[in-house]
Every structure is written in C-alpha cells, then in structure tokens.
C-alpha cells in the first residue's frame, strides 16, 4: 500500500511531533482521495460488456473494499504507532482519526 513503508516500524511517538503527525495524516488522506478519484475515472472508462470489468466495477463501487480499506489500515497503523494519538494537550485521550474516516465512508 502507498505510504506503508513510511508507517511501518515507527517505534515511538517521539519520532514525530503532533503537528508533523497531523501533516502526515493529511498527506495520507489527500493520497487516498486522489486514488479514489483515479479509480472512479477508471470505472467510468470500463466497458459494461466485460463481466470481469463489471464485477470489478461493482467491487470497487464499495470503496471500503478497494481503497479505503488500504488507507484505513495505514491510518490505523499510524494511530497505533503513536500509541495514544498525538494529543499532548489532552493527555490520554485517543484521537482515532482513522476510525472516524471509516465511520464516514
């Protein structure tokens, strides 16, 4: 998955600050939106005559199967890496942005 190498193995929240975490999260969301748009464009170009193409289009109409699942994993990895999220102002409070995205799909 895109960005996976950037997220895997990050051992400690001190590797990034909260501010940098938000920026990285924003970059992930932006990449997800771009990829989503690319897939939607691909779907529009596919011919309905091909059963393989149409089944793929049906699968991909549920973005959770195609794209968001991948990015949600990345976001969840990122959240897990941070241990408790990035909020120092509200110690101990988890900011699960990834699950928030999942709820919104």
């Amino acid at each position: 998955a895109p960005f996976r190498s950037a997220l895997e193995g990050l051992p400690d929240p001190t590797a990034l600050s909260e501010k940098e975490g938000r920026l990285l999260l924003a970059a992930l969301v932006k990449a997800y939106v771009q990829r989503k748009n690319e897939l939607e464009q691909e779907q529009e170009q596919e011919t309905e005559g091909s059963s393989l193409d149409s089944s793929r289009a049906k699968r991909c109409s549920n973005l959770s199967t195609c794209v968001l699942g991948t990015y949600s994993k990345d976001l969840n990895n990122f959240h897990t890496f941070s241990g408790i999220g990035f909020g120092a102002e509200t110690p101990g409070k988890k900011r699960d942005i990834a699950s928030g995205l999942e709820r919104g799909r």
Partner: antibody
Framework: VEESGGRLVTPGTPLTLTCTVS????????INWVRQAPGKGLEWIAY?????GSSYASWAKGRFTISKTSTTVDLRITSPTTEDTATYFC???????????WGPGTLVTVSS | DPVLTQTPSSVSAALGGTVTINCQAS????????LSWYQQKPGQPPKLLIY???KLASGVPSRFSGSGSGTQFTLTISGVQCDDAATYYC??????????FGFGGGTEVVVK
C-alpha cells in the same frame, strides 16, 4: 550512536558536532542532543524528528542549530561561550515507549 | 520546556535500606506518564532505569520501581546495594507542536 567534533575552541568560534548513527535509520528514530557540564547535571538542548522538524530548549534557541542527513545529525554551536564547556551526548531518546541509546559523548572546551 | 524539580539533591542510604527520590514537573507530561529515570556513574553516559513512569527497562533489577502521574513522580530503590551508588535523574517530555524535554537536577545516592 557516536559523537565527534568536540575540541578546544575560543569563545565566539562556531563549532559543529556530529552524531553518526548505525544499526537504525533516522527515518524511523528521532535524535536529541543533551549536554553535561563538568560536575553538573544533564541539560536537554535540541530535538530533530524523522521528518526533520526541530525543537530547542528555551535557553538554547539561537545558540544552537540542529540538522541532519540520512546517517548523521549535526549540532552547531553558533557562538560558543565558556558556559558551553561540557560533554555533549547524542541520544536516541528520551523516548516514550522504547529504550534510549546514548553515545559516549564528546567533550567541548571553550576557553580563551 | 518542562521544568523538572528533583528532591532531594543528595541522600545517604544504609545498605539494604530504601531510597525514595521525587520529581515534580512544571506541567503535565505527555499522556501523564512521559517520565523516565536514569542512573549515571562518573565517566559514563546515563543508563535508563524506568520509562513511562513505571515500566522497568530491560536488564534493570526489580529493586528499582517508579510511580506517579501527571506532574508528580517517584523513584524507589528497595534493598539498596553498593552498586546503586550513583546520581539519578528524571527526564520528562511534552508535545506542543514539537517535542520538548527536560531533566531534573539530579540526586546523588550515597550508600553507607
């Protein structure tokens, strides 16, 4: 982690200390510089994140600059004074949930 | 930066006795528990004993323990050994648009 660049300098002469890391990547671990004056306690100086973001102790702003390459982290003492005489440690830490790695330190002596 | 006030500055302990060192932070630390304890002996870099306020670092004897949350923390050495004679430091971290760290002033432990 291993520090280098410590030496005797005269006040006002800029000095750059280098921390060379091996066995782990600066893309995954942040680095801090900490110093200890002879017979004194530990003082945190500066931090650099995996993305290159930096922060400084309030007393160190303007006096020090932290930067990094793929395998090294530099600490520049912009205009050393005698008060900067200390052993300077490069540290993978303090960290929240993993163990620290401290270098042996490099001695900086500022004297006229 | 977080200001960490460590007390006492020096303590004398009987062999087999108990030592308690306190550390007070000027503000709540990250997740209320970003507090580490270090042991330092002359000529050596600090050695991590406790992280996340109460977790024992690998290879550290169980006679060392840490407790506390928010701004008040304690290191306890139970059954003090001769080898425990050293200087002990607390260190804490906060994240407010960047990581900032601070060290306590140190506590010298003398074993009688």
């Amino acid at each position: 982690v291993e520090e280098s660049g410590g030496r005797l300098v005269t006040p006002g002469t800029p000095l750059t200390l280098t921390c060379t890391v091996s066995g782990f990547s600066l893309n995954r671990y942040a680095i801090n510089w900490v110093r200890q004056a002879p017979g004194k306690g530990l003082e945190w100086i500066a931090y650099i994140s995996i993305r290159g973001g930096s922060s400084y102790a309030s007393w160190a702003k303007g006096r020090f600059t932290i930067s990094k390459t793929s395998t090294t982290v530099d600490l520049r003492i912009t205009s050393p004074t005698t008060e900067d005489t200390a052993t300077y440690f490069c540290v993978r830490g303090p960290t929240y949930q993993i163990e620290d790695i401290w270098g042996p330190g490099t001695l900086v002596t500022v004297s006229s | 930066d977080p200001v960490l006030t460590q007390t006492p500055s020096s303590v004398s302990a009987a062999l087999g006795g108990t030592v308690t060192i306190n550390c007070q932070a000027s503000q709540s630390l990250y997740n209320n528990n970003f507090l580490s304890w270090y042991q330092q002996k002359p000529g050596q870099p600090p050695k991590l004993l406790i992280y996340q306020a109460s977790k024992l670092a690998s290879g550290v004897p169980s006679r060392f323990s840490g407790s506390g949350s928010g701004t008040q923390f304690t290191l306890t050495i139970s059954g003090v050994q001769c080898d425990d004679a050293a200087t002990y430091y607390c260190a804490g971290g906060i994240d407010i648009d960047g990581w900032y760290f601070g060290f306590g002033g140190g506590t010298e432990v003398v074993v009688k």
